[in-house]
């Protein structure tokens, strides 16, 4: 009988040790979770504050409403210009309105003067249709003024306050456009 009692006592003690071990593990796990939680919260706060402090457009880009614009300092053909913009998470400029056209031409006057700048407009050589790269057609007031005589592919560019057309293989400056970062407050 005594042996039976002592065996039960030992089993109970073993159970207790296991439970203590489990509790210790749980406490350790909880502490680890709390630390991770603190780390996550700190990380999120840092991210939010850095996003809060950062400007809606990258350095050397100009903001207007929801858009950021980059005016290149190098010349390239139309295709390379678009590739350069795409590398920056942007595309060649797509002019949506007269207001945007006025902003662009006004900004260009201040920055560089009367040069040629590729925009994201290309003409289908077979149908003669002008398209922005998202596939939309330019509004009637924003069609290139002169139809190029070139038998080659034709693309659109801005000069002074006009939208014109030229062989896509000619070298020009270019303008990239992307969405401005929106403040979360």
């Amino acid at each position: 009988k005594l042996l039976q009692v002592s065996t039960i006592a030992m089993q109970q003690q073993e159970k207790l040790i296991q439970q203590e071990r489990a509790l210790l593990n749980f406490t350790e796990w909880k502490r680890s979770c709390a630390l991770q939680m603190k780390y996550c919260q700190a990380f999120m706060q840092n991210s939010l504050s850095s996003a809060h402090n950062s400007s809606p457009c990258p350095n050397n880009w100009i903001q207007n409403r929801e858009s950021c614009y980059y005016v290149s300092e190098i010349w390239s053909i139309w295709h390379t210009s678009q590739e350069n913009c795409l590398k920056e998470g942007s595309t060649l400029l797509q002019i949506e309105s007269k207001e945007e056209m006025d902003f662009i031409t006004g900004s260009l006057r201040k920055i560089k003067g009367s040069y040629d700048y590729w925009v994201g407009l290309s003409q289908d050589g077979h149908s003669g249709r002008w398209l922005w790269q998202d596939g939309s057609s330019p509004s009637p007031g924003l069609l290139p003024a002169e139809r190029s005589q070139s038998a080659n592919q034709v693309c659109g560019y801005v000069k002074s306050n006009s939208l014109l057309s030229s062989n896509c293989s000619t070298w020009k400056y270019f303008i990239c456009e992307k969405y401005a970062l929106r403040s979360s407050v």
Partner: nanobody, 112 residues
């Protein structure tokens, strides 16, 4: 450099269907309008359909409107042309095109 490789052409009966594919490489496919053009025997190149960089604004020449569907998969750098209710007049070599650059084309023949 820009490379466009068309496939999926063949001989089909009037009223039949085909799906053409165009595998693109050498440029950022997702950044450009893409088109299908065709050249019938003894004729010049004719624009068939175009689609915007993100898959929006599909447009078609009148003769294929309602029968052909242009689409793209930017993750796969591939342009498609689904051609339903084919007619003998659709017989041509079909090319996919980006900014005046074309592949070698794929032959589509509609005949009974």
């Amino acid at each position: 450099q820009v490379q466009l490789v068309e496939s999926g052409g063949g001989l089909v009966q009037p009223g039949g269907s085909l799906r053409l594919s165009c595998a693109a490489s050498g440029f950022t496919f997702s950044g450009y309008v893409m088109s299908w053009v065709r050249q019938a025997p003894g004729k010049g190149l004719e624009w068939v359909a175009s689609i915007g960089s993100g898959g929006g604004y599909p447009s078609y020449t009148d003769s294929v409107e309602g029968r052909f569907t242009i689409s793209r998969d930017n993750a796969k750098n591939t342009l498609y042309l689904l051609m339903d209710n084919l007619k003998p007049d659709d017989t041509a070599v079909y090319y996919c095109e980006m900014l005046g650059r074309r592949g070698q084309g794929t032959q589509v023949t509609v005949s009974s």
